[in-house]
Amino acid sequence: QEDEDGDYEELVLALRSEEDGLAEAPEHGTTATFHRCAKDPWRLPGTYVVVLKEETHLSQSERTARRLQAQAARRGYLTKILHVFHGLLPGFLVKMSGDLLELALKLPHVDYIEEDSSVFAQSIPWNLERITPPRYRADEYQPPDGGSLVEVYLLDTSIQSDHREIEGRVMVTDFENVPEEDGTRFHRQASKCDSHGTHLAGVVSGRDAGVAKGASMRSLRVLNCQGKGTVSGTLIGLEFIRKSQLVQPVGPLVVLLPLAGGYSRVLNAACQRLARAGVVLVTAAGNFRDDACLYSPASAPEVITVGATNAQDQPVTLGTLGTNFGRCVDLFAPGEDIIGASSDCSTCFVSQSGTSQAAAHVAGIAAMMLSAEPELTLAELRQRLIHFSAKDVINEAWFPEDQRVLTPNLVAALPPSTHGAGWQLFCRTVWSAHSGPTRMATAVARCAPDEELLSCSSFSRSGKRRGERMEAQGGKLVCRAHNAFGGEGVYAIARCCLLPQANCSVHTAPPAEASMGTRVHCHQQGHVLTGCSSHWEVEDLGTHKPPVLRPRGQPNQCVGHREASIHASCCHAPGLECKVKEHGIPAPQEQVTVACEEGWTLTGCSALPGTSHVLGAYAVDNTCVVRSRDVSTTGSTSEGAVTAVAICCRSRHLAQASQELQ
């Protein structure tokens, strides 16, 4: 088999004898899977990432690669091992015929195989530059800490590191892994090759137009002169960063990935591993005016995914497309007409637009936050980014209707002071993927490893759902929502909070026999109620109304429909106090809200009663939103009455700790 570029001499015709002594059978009952990019034009058939099981050692990876070569040679196929992965993910990159996939999937230790695919710079026009001087007074923006303790890695095009705006701030590593440029007549003009990366380096750390003016950067070249790279090249780049981190541990690391490709299991997995090694990854949501969950690394939960807004806080339109959106976006940031260093000359500036520019802003803000508080974990940093964002300023009408509720209405902002936020109880809302419409379909929302799940709710556009419950999965609580017969699917909504030294548990009451409804409370000493969930097996709860307001003196109680099981999230943490706040509207209304007061954080959001005309409940920042079916379809007024129940908490312990520091 000839490979496309005719590079035969380096291909290894492995000897048949290599196979001898390597007859380990694949683990019984496990089947490796094959994955490829859903976007056909972005596929790169002929190159495959073979991902091995987690505990596979380097020697086993090498042996498995040799075994593949030997078995391929036996069948008359040439293969070439391009890279053996270790340090981040075990596995190898192989150039081979697709005919060999079945064989490769049966090799020992193989977890899955992914066909290589393209990734792209996320700026427009990333190579059509309009030179403009900085259009503001530089002394208007003097950040308190310029991010000097933080190193920002940039995986992008080559960059002009001696540009006046970034000279001395960027160390160009010797890492380069890029595909050939497309087209026979492509002219490799240096300034165009450097355009995207130079601009982003300037946005992050430029002297005059940068966000974190003190941050130092390291650049890795994973995008070619056309702004195109590969998943495999990006993986090898991430591995390079991990190895550098191990060889020479420095302070906090931020990795900026201003690129996007189709959904990639392996790229997301690599990002997860790097994030769990303490690295903060920031990526572009993508410029496809589409759900960011369909792209990588934007869809990786551990990555901070950034959409783009303009000066009017509106989502950025880019030609016929625009910023991506949806539940995989963490927040938005400026991404239209952003001025930064231009590679056209050493003192030139240019304006570029896209989610790359937005991600660069957030990488700069992250660098400054980490420089001020180097011990911040990824979860703490993400929560702070969300907390300090401008809320509810984006015009959601720009997003498709079904994505509006899922897309965070947050625009990144620098904290007013980089210190002193430690006393806050930080929480965020995490939406699951859609369950799909089958009768038994469920959706699961998860918090990050060092966050606590304090409450769980669900939402269905059709209203046909069977509630939600918190359950243990792999030693951690998750939020599971249940679809109902005839439903179009549900979402699970987790409220994920930073609560140090917390001990949380779920108390469940089965459906009540009596007509008073189901109740459950936190009975352990020192435990407070942080959230209520209800789950039912019947298809339609009907109109039964339990007493909505709790009896006085029983704040630690969840109440619900008599046919539903009720789940109380009960937590003990130093100084944690919570209170229930309700807002009931007697007349039918499509939306009922209740918000926590200043100084209190929303941890739980649920609806009473749990009848079928209630679409669900979810938290938006510090407000609990309960949505009901269109009033015109609900029938009687009594059934239309809905109460939004918020549980608001604060931590006196965190407040005291903060005061002691000051």
Epitope: P133, R137, A138, D139, S161, D162, R164, E167, A190, S346
Partner: antibody
Framework: QIQLVQSGAEVKKPGASVKVSCKAS????????ISWVRQAPGQGLEWMGW????????NYAQKVQGRVTMTTDTSTSTVYMELRSLRSDDTAVYFC????????WGQGTTVTVSS | QSALTQPASVSGSPGQSITISCTGT?????????VSWYQQHPGKPPKLMIY???NRPSGVSNRFSGSKSGNTASLTISGLQAEDEADYFC?????????FGGGTKLAVL
């Protein structure tokens, strides 16, 4: 350590050319260009231009544009500044300095233009 | 004629503080964060003392500090010492080049 070492003093006649060299060491050359600055006797500093070690691009001050050429030899980590059609008011000490930030300076090269 | 205006001379006694000003326009000092200050002793190359308005390179005494307001940058030297006697130059970016001040001769009395 980071060093910029310049060539020795030159005496030239009006109308002639001079070529001063500056050898850089001790840092990643491509992260910084080299600026050239001159100082006439008893006078202030005058920025003449900049050249990139990365791609050879140049940025010349208007006052000397057309008479100055800056070049690099990456194999020897050396930058050259050639000034043509010398006049008596070009008599000065010529310094090379690292980048636009000019955080490290060469020792200076005295160029005397005299008939 | 230099693009940035500095006083020709400034003097002070040991232990005192002095301030040297550097005035430009919104196209140089006022428009950029990159104002630097250099110290030059006779027969020596200039030495960077302050960069990007107020940052000190490692090895430079914390007696030297920089600031900026509008189109004017300032260098302050506190606790004057005899070795501070030298010429001081400010510099700034412009849109495409660099400009220096005419220099200020500091005498320590």
């Amino acid at each position: 350590q980071i060093q910029l070492v310049q060539s020795g003093a030159e005496v030239k006649k009006p109308g002639a050319s001079v070529k001063v060299s500056c050898k850089a060491s001790g840092y990643t050359l491509t992260s910084y260009g080299i600026s050239w600055v001159r100082q006439a006797p008893g006078q202030g500093l005058e920025w003449m231009g900049w050249i990139s070690f990365y791609n050879g691009n140049t940025n010349y001050a208007q006052k000397v544009q057309g008479r100055v050429t800056m070049t690099t030899d990456t194999s020897t980590s050396t930058v050259y500044m050639e000034l043509r059609s010398l006049r008596s008011d070009d008599t000065a000490v010529y310094f090379c300095a690292r980048g636009y930030g000019m955080d490290v300076w060469g020792q200076g090269t005295t160029v005397t233009v005299s008939s | 004629q230099s693009a940035l205006t500095q006083p020709a001379s400034v003097s002070g006694s040991p232990g005192q503080s002095i301030t040297i000003s550097c005035t430009g326009t919104s196209s140089d000092v006022g428009g950029y964060n990159s104002v630097s200050w250099y110290q030059q002793h006779p027969g020596k190359p200039p030495k960077l003392m302050i960069y990007e308005v107020s940052n000190r390179p490692s090895g430079v005494s914390n007696r030297f500090s920089g600031s900026k307001s509008g189109n004017t940058a300032s260098l302050t030297i506190s606790g004057l010492q005899a070795e501070d006697e030298a010429d001081y130059f400010c510099s700034s970016y412009t849109s495409t080049s660099m400009v220096f001040g005419g220099g200020t001769k500091l005498a320590v009395l």
